[in-house]
């Protein structure tokens, strides 16, 4: 069964900067990745970025830079403007879509005890969807 992993880390050099890393473990090619915060895509989450493997990326504030790391993983840099966007308490979700086979989504957040720069992966919450 395909799986999605999500890892959130605070940058050691800038405490207001966070990076979300997401990856897809499974066969097949990815046609679109959606990153949201505050909940899963389609369930009240707010979209931060969408990435297409050929056509590029789109992002919305407070997302700063979305990019592909490999053919099956992405990263999204975020700029925390302060109290208005408390990333440390926020859930980030990544959905990997493979049209028309299906889509797979998982969520994660910054580990509560994590020090800046450490990137201990949280326990992912898989949200599986069969389209």
């Amino acid at each position: 069964t395909p799986e999605v992993w999500v890892q959130v880390q605070m940058e050691a050099t800038e405490l207001s900067s966070f990076t979300v890393h997401c990856g897809f473990l499974g066969p097949g090619s990815i046609s679109l990745v959606t990153v949201s915060w505050g909940g899963p895509d389609g369930a009240g989450g707010t979209k931060l970025a969408v990435l297409h493997p050929e056509l590029g990326t789109r992002q919305w504030a407070p997302a700063r830079q979305a990019r592909w790391e490999t053919q099956s993983s992405i990263s999204l840099a975020l700029e925390d403007s302060g109290a208005s966007s408390p990333f440390a308490n926020t859930t980030f979700c990544c959905k990997f879509a493979s049209f028309p086979e299906g889509s797979w989504e998982s969520c994660g957040s910054l580990p509560p005890s994590s020090d800046p720069g450490l990137s201990a992966p949280p326990t992912p919450v898989p949200i599986l969807r069969a389209d």
């Epitope: 046609s31 679109l32 389609g42 009240g44 707010t46 789109r58």
Partner: nanobody
């Protein structure tokens, strides 16, 4: 969660017509487009038609003048009127919501189970 349910597929003779419907429900915030894709047996999927958030319909060249896409916002529904059907239109048709990266393509983010259209005499 976004749910898209297609209906209206079936068997039709060449030159005939069909109207596909898609009932949409759920949260579709920050999507740019809604449309129809199709996948013929043994072939790659292709975007057939979509409507931008500004209401402009766009079509792949092979269906221009034959297919018409429309929306009913009150019913949260999308339609595809298919006229002058050809054997090469035989495919599973999927209703999709997605994002625009260029003018002509609606990248699917959510889609339905699909409805089969068979054009044969």
């Amino acid at each position: 969660e976004v749910q898209l349910v297609e209906s209206g597929g079936g068997l039709v003779q060449p030159g005939g017509s069909l109207r596909l419907s898609c009932a949409a429900s759920g949260y579709t915030s920050r999507t740019d487009c809604m449309g129809w894709f199709r996948q013929a047996p043994g072939k790659e999927h292709e975007g057939v038609a979509h409507i931008d958030s500004d209401g402009i319909p766009r079509y792949v060249d092979s269906v221009k003048g034959r297919f018409t896409i429309s929306q009913d916002h009150a019913k949260n529904s999308l339609y595809l009127q298919m006229n002058s059907l050809r054997a090469e239109d035989t495919a599973v048709y999927y209703c999709v919501v997605g994002f625009k990266f260029d003018e002509d393509y609606c990248a699917p983010n959510d889609w339905g189970q699909g409805t089969m259209v068979t054009v044969s005499s």
